[in-house]
Structure formats: C-alpha cells, structure tokens
C-alpha cells in the first residue's frame, strides 16, 4: 500500500480468482483513543471499532472511502484504490491502446518544434468518474524539470457503438535549448483513476523523435505565362524553430486530382517554391518535415488548382 | 560562443555537400545495423545514449547560431580551445568563433573515425561475419575531414590484446552509430546555417 496523495492510498493486488488479497491496517487520524467506529462509503454498517481497522482487501467491494467516527462526528477519511497486477503485468483497463506506432501505445506525444514544448494525448471510452494527473521529467535517475498543465478533455468521437474521449496535456521543459543533442529521454507519467481503480501509464521519448511540424503557411499559386505550369510557393510555419537556416525543413509537393484513384504527382524539395503542372479540378498540397532528422511529416496545406 | 551572421565569399562551403553525404551514410549504416542486428538491443529505445565526445569537444555550444545565444539554456560553460586554420574557412573575414566551431567538428570526426576503425577491426574477427562498417561511411568521414583541413595530431588506432566480446562490440556499434547520427544532424544544421550566413 502506498499514498497517492493526502488520505488516498493505492493497494496493489495480484489479481486472480480466489486470490488472498492484501491485509491493510487503517489508522484514524485523531488524538482520540476510545469510542471510535469505522464505516465504508455511504453505509452506516459498523465495520469495526478502535483507533485502527484491519481489513483484507481482495476485490473492488473492499475498496472505497473508509471513515472513522466518534459520537456521530467524522474524525478522518482514507480512500482506498486498487491497482491490479494481472500475471505480472499492471492492468491497462482505463485507456485505449492506440496501436500507433506500435501495440501497447496508450500515450501519444508530439512537438511542433525543438523548444521543449510538447503535447500528449490519450483515449478512453469512459465518460464519468475519471481523473488524470500528469507528471514529466527529463531523465529518471537525476530528473530535470518539465512542467505539465492539467489534462483536459480535448475531443469526443463516436466509434461504432461507443463514444471515445480524447484527453490531452501540454508540457514544457523548464530549461530547453533547441539546438541541444538529447541524451536523456523525456519521461511522461499519467496517473488515471476510474471510480476505485488506479492505473499508471508512462511514455519515454526524445523531442527529436516526436517532432511534427505545423503545415507550411501562405501556400500560393502563380500561373506561369503560356503554360499549364504554376509556381507554388509557401513559407515555414510560424511555430517552427528558428533560425530556419539551422532548423531547416524539407517539403513534399503533391498534385492530386478530384478522384482519390487518380495518379498523384509528387515533388520533393528543400526550397519554399516548386513548379508543377496544375490539372483541372486538382488540388496542390504541401507538407513539411525536418530536413535532417526524419520524424513525422506535417499535415498537408492545400489549395485548389482553379 | 556563437556563430555570427557573417557574409563569407560565395561558394565557400564545400563542407555542406560533404556533411549531407555524411548524414546519408551514417543513417544508412544505422538502418543496416538495426536490420542485421534485429536480435540485439539496437533501437533508440533500447540503447544507452552515450556521447564519446562529451567533455572533449563542444560542437553544439561552439556552433550555436547567433539567434540562440540569447537562450540561457543553450549557453553551456564548457570551454575548449582548438587550432584555427581550415580550408572551409575560405575568407580571413571568418570569425574566430566559426573557426572554433569547425575545428570542434573536425575533432568529433577524428574521434569517431578512430572508434569506428577500431571497431571494424574487431568485427572482421567475428566468425559469424554478421556486420561490418560501411566503407562508404568511413570514406565520407575522411572527405569531410579533408575539406575541413585542420592540422591535428593523429590519434593512434586503439588496439586491444584481449579476445573481443563480439556481442558487446555489436551493441557498442549501435550506441556509436546512434550518437554519430545525432552529431551528423548537428553538423548538417551548422553547415546549412553557415552556408546561408
């Protein structure tokens, strides 16, 4: 048993049918010695008396808010949560496996640049009685500071019969140098509590591996005289690290017809312009990627050919 | 400890082309190592990230773009002195800081070259003959060093009398390649920045 926060405790259970569970001793936080009784949640049934209460915690029915009273007055509370260990593996019931980039990916994180700011998000089908707490650091043995905000519900989607909820959090490394070569990964830890179930999820990454630039901005077309060709131009996104000559991007320019089946023409360039043939009803899209370290491509910025 | 935005002579940067080749070569070699050594811990998540140049060179700090010198977190106090003549510096106008930066890059390349050659000698003794260093990568390191053209004492190749542990050597190869790829990215950024300056 360990303390998650004041008066909230996590009981770790080896989770299998007929498991013996864990013996837990609760102590009433009071100078009083006599006439103390214990109850669980809203029930008025007295579970025991005395300054300490010994319970065998086996299932969720044994978890909850234990309260000690004296003469009708509440003295203190202890909330017991359960953390299930299933055959040596901590349970992951609360969050959905996003399966990207690999199985057992519960937290996904992205950064728009090298400033040390990043966003993480996760999915769940649970809509109520759910709380999250996020901590982060650079490295784990001698951790350096990363400050995270509060997790917020950022999107709701309908997936088949189920509603899916996306939560996200923004974090900022306290002293980040965009040019630094990372040798210690960023660690992100999310505590999740659903009703009386506690779970924790972690992700470890280098900022360089989670970079996903914003799409190029100011995408414009300039028709070339007496030609079906157009000059496409764009600019680096505002959120990208500067100077751009140091933090350079490479670009992919795509000409896509109205039908998805039509052949796509693609051009790769390090410049911020390209000359392409504009077909009728087609659209021109440009996306960006770090020129030197191949992390994710940005989303597409698009303009119609007409 | 930074690079001023100077305007060196046009076409002064043969090093840009070489640094691009270097990044391509090390990335290809790393990919090959990860495929060939699939049953070894060779991915970024699995290896320890070690920098063999740590406390010996200070490339990131010496080559910091001027725009980042206002960022306190980028200003590390490590000081290293380097010899300051080189053919990538095609103009006398080029600052002392730029010379310091390029000589730091040269020292990095020299250290990695020695490590890779020592490692290759060990890998050639492996009866499994599972993986060797790409000669192209070693050649590209050499070309960039020649383009930088700094006078520097030659570092003798390390030789070891004891029987090599091939498992450890292959894991060390992965660690070195990951670190060298990160340094090659920094070198490429620096060359691109200098080329635009």
């Amino acid at each position: 048993i360990w303390e998650l926060k004041k008066d909230v405790y996590v009981v770790e259970l080896d989770w299998y049918p007929d498991a013996p569970g864990e013996m837990v001793v609760l102590t009433c936080d009071t100078p009083e010695e006599d006439g103390i009784t214990w109850t669980l949640d809203q029930s008025s049934e007295v579970l025991g008396s005395g300054k300490t209460l010994t319970i065998q915690v086996k299932e969720f029915g044994d978890a909850g808010q234990y309260t000690c009273h004296k003469g009708g007055e509440v003295l203190s509370h202890s909330l017991l949560l359960l953390h299930k260990k299933e055959d040596g593996i901590w349970s992951t019931d609360i969050l959905k496996d996003q399966k990207e980039p690999k199985n057992k990916t519960f937290l996904r994180c992205e950064a728009k640049n090298y400033s040390g700011r990043f966003t993480c998000w996760w999915l769940t089908t649970i809509s109520t009685d759910l709380t999250f707490s996020v901590k982060s650091s650079r490295g784990s043995s001698d951790p350096q500071g990363v400050t995270c905000g509060a997790a917020t519900l950022s999107a709701e989607r309908v997936r088949g019969d189920n509603k899916e909820y996306e939560y996200s959090v923004e974090c900022q490394e306290d002293s980040a140098c965009p040019a630094a070569e990372e040798s210690l990964p960023i660690e992100v830890m999310v505590d999740a509590v659903h009703k009386l179930k506690y779970e924790n999820y972690t992700s470890s990454f280098f900022i360089r591996d989670i970079i996903k630039p914003d799409p190029p901005k100011n995408l414009q077309l300039k028709p070339l005289k007496n030609s079906r060709q157009v000059e496409v131009s764009w600019e680096y996104p505002d959120t990208w690290s500067t100077p751009h000559s140091y933090f350079s991007l490479t670009f992919c320019v795509q000409v896509q017809g109205k039908s998805k089946r039509e052949k796509k023409d693609r051009v790769f360039t390090d410049k911020t312009s390209a000359t392409v043939i504009c077909r009728k009803n087609a659209s021109i899209s440009v996306r960006a990627q770090d020129r030197y370290y191949s992390s994710s491509w940005s989303e597409w910025a698009s303009v119609p050919c007409s | 400890r930074n690079l001023p935005v100077a305007t060196p002579d046009p076409g002064m940067f043969p090093c840009l082309h070489h640094s691009q080749n270097l990044l391509r070569a090390v990335s290809n070699m790393l990919q090959k190592a990860r495929q060939t050594l699939e049953f070894y811990p060779c991915t970024s998540e699995e290896i320890d990230h070690e920098d063999i140049t740590k406390d010996k060179t200070s490339t990131v700090e010496a080559c910091l773009p001027l725009e980042l010198t206002k960022n306190e977190s980028c200003l590390n106090s490590r000081e290293t002195s380097f010899i300051t003549n080189g053919s990538c510096l095609a103009s006398r106008k080029t600052s002392f800081m730029m010379a310091l930066c390029l000589s730091s890059i040269y020292e990095d390349l020299k250290m990695y070259q020695v490590e890779f050659k020592t490692m290759n000698a060990k890998l050639l003794m492996d009866p499994k003959r599972q993986i060797f260093l790409d000669q192209n990568m070693l050649a590209v390191i050499d070309e960039l060093m020649q383009a930088l053209n700094f006078n520097s004492e030659t570092v003798p190749q390390k030789s070891s009398l004891e029987e090599p542990d091939f498992y450890k050597t292959k894991i060390k190869l992965c660690i070195l390649l990951h670190a060298f790829r990160i340094r090659a990215v920094t070198i490429d950024r620096v060359m691109s920045y200098l080329n635009a300056s």
Epitope: Y16, A19, E86, G88, I89, N103 | -
Partner: antibody
Framework: QVQLVQSGGGVVQPGRSLRLSCAAS????????MHWVRQAPGKGLEWVAF????????YYADSVKGRFTISRDNSKNTLYLQMKSLRAEDTAVYYC????????WGQGTMVTVSS | SYVLTQPPSVSGTPGQRVTISCSGG????????VKWYQQLPGTAPKLLIY???QRPSGVPDRFSGSKSGTSASLAITGVQAEDEADYYC????????????FGTGTKVTVL
C-alpha cells in the same frame, strides 16, 4: 472454490462450425480476463484467444484469426468460443483458463475435425 | 506457433537434480514473467511456478524456477517417480496484450 466446466466439443466436418462453452463458478467471473488454450493430440499447448474482463478487447492467435470468435456473457458467468470454417488442424482438446498469476483450467473438451 | 524452445526430453534417476531450459526472446521472456506447468497424461496442466520463481501453495519445494535475460529454467532437485510428466514453460508476447506463448514441452522420465 473456483470451477470451470466446459461443454460443446464433438466431431465436426471440415468447413463447419462449433461453439464451445465454459461455465464459471466460485468467483466473480466479470472481474477477470479469460483465455482459450488448445492441445492437438500428442502435441504441446497452444494459446488460442483472450478476452478482457468486460469483453471490451479480444485477441487471437494468427492461426485462428478471422475464423474463431471469443465472447462472454457476464450475466450468465459463461465464456464462449465460436469456431467457424474448421480445419483438420483445429483438432485438439480445448481448455478455458482464467487470466492471472494463478490460473484455473477447465477439464478440457475434445474437438475433432474430420470428414 | 511455439515461440519458446525446450529440450524434447530429459531424464534422471530418483533423487537426482533435473533441469529444463526454456529459451525465448526480448519480446517474451525478456520483458515478461515466466510460468511452468506440469501435465500428467489425460489431465489439464497444473501450475508449478509463476512470476519466474514463485511456487503456489501445495507445490513441493523440490520445484524451483529462475529467469535470466531471455531464458528461464525449471529445476527439480531430488526428482521422484511421480514427477514423470510433460512440462511446459509459458510467457507473454509483449507486442500483443494477453497473448500467451508456450514452450515446445519437455518429457521428464524418471529412470
């Protein structure tokens, strides 16, 4: 006392279907994940499928993916394995087992796929 | 479909120490716990060891398990006639939740 009682085995022709059941008692069935494991005659144990405690996620061995479906009815304390497009190589004793460090096994039920 | 490799058979005389090896990889034994089962002819497997080296109550202390890296082993110190059976190691595949991987099985013969 944890008990898993299996039924539904038998002889079936290739290409046909069969449904196995596993009735659980002596524990809170709805709180635990469940597996199906099989053993071909004279061969070793092979994992077939797994279902989470609430039925939200199901996982299958490549050899049965797309043909077998694991399901559960927590109100009836019963685990199922629906087997379609059966092949001769599916001939085996099928066991249901609880998920956990200490697992409980059913008595096994024989499925024979033969023409 | 057997990811974990065991010797097909091992034998020993009563009182001898018998060990069975179980070899896997980084995605199974390397990152998950190992179990051992004993299976007597015509019966369901019985759990002998869980969590690499833990014995459930009721299992004699002559059975012990260990794990190192991507391999595990089961030792029977002072093997007895009733220990003649098939033994299987089991772990999980890290890439797929709940995916149990079993060893090829070892027949223990008491001479």
């Amino acid at each position: 006392q944890v008990q898993l009682v299996q039924s539904g085995g038998g002889v079936v022709q290739p290409g046909r279907s069969l449904r196995l059941s596993c009735a659980a008692s002596g524990f809170t069935f709805s709180s635990y994940g469940m597996h199906w494991v099989r053993q071909a005659p004279g061969k070793g144990l092979e994992w077939v499928a797994f279902i989470r405690y609430d039925g939200s996620n199901k996982y299958y061995a490549d050899s049965v993916k797309g043909r077998f479906t694991i399901s559960r009815d927590n109100s009836k304390n019963t685990l199922y394995l629906q087997m379609k497009s059966l092949r001769a190589e599916d001939t085996a004793v099928y066991y249901c087992t609880t998920h956990g460090s200490h697992d409980n096994w059913g008595q096994g039920t024989m499925v024979t796929v033969s023409s | 479909s057997y990811v974990l490799t065991q010797p097909p058979s091992v034998s020993g005389t009563p009182g001898q120490r018998v060990t069975i090896s179980c070899s896997g990889g980084r995605s199974n034994i390397g990152s998950n716990t190992v179990k051992w089962y004993q299976q007597l002819p015509g019966t369901a497997p019985k759990l002998l060891i869980y969590g690499n080296d833990q014995r459930p109550s009721g299992v004699p202390d002559r059975f012990s398990g260990s794990k190192s890296g991507t391999s595990a082993s089961l030792a029977i110190t002072g093997v007895q006639a009733e220990d003649e059976a098939d033994y299987y190691c089991q772990s999980y595949d890290s890439s797929l939740w709940g995916s149990r991987v079993f060893g090829t099985g070892t027949k223990v013969t008491v001479l």
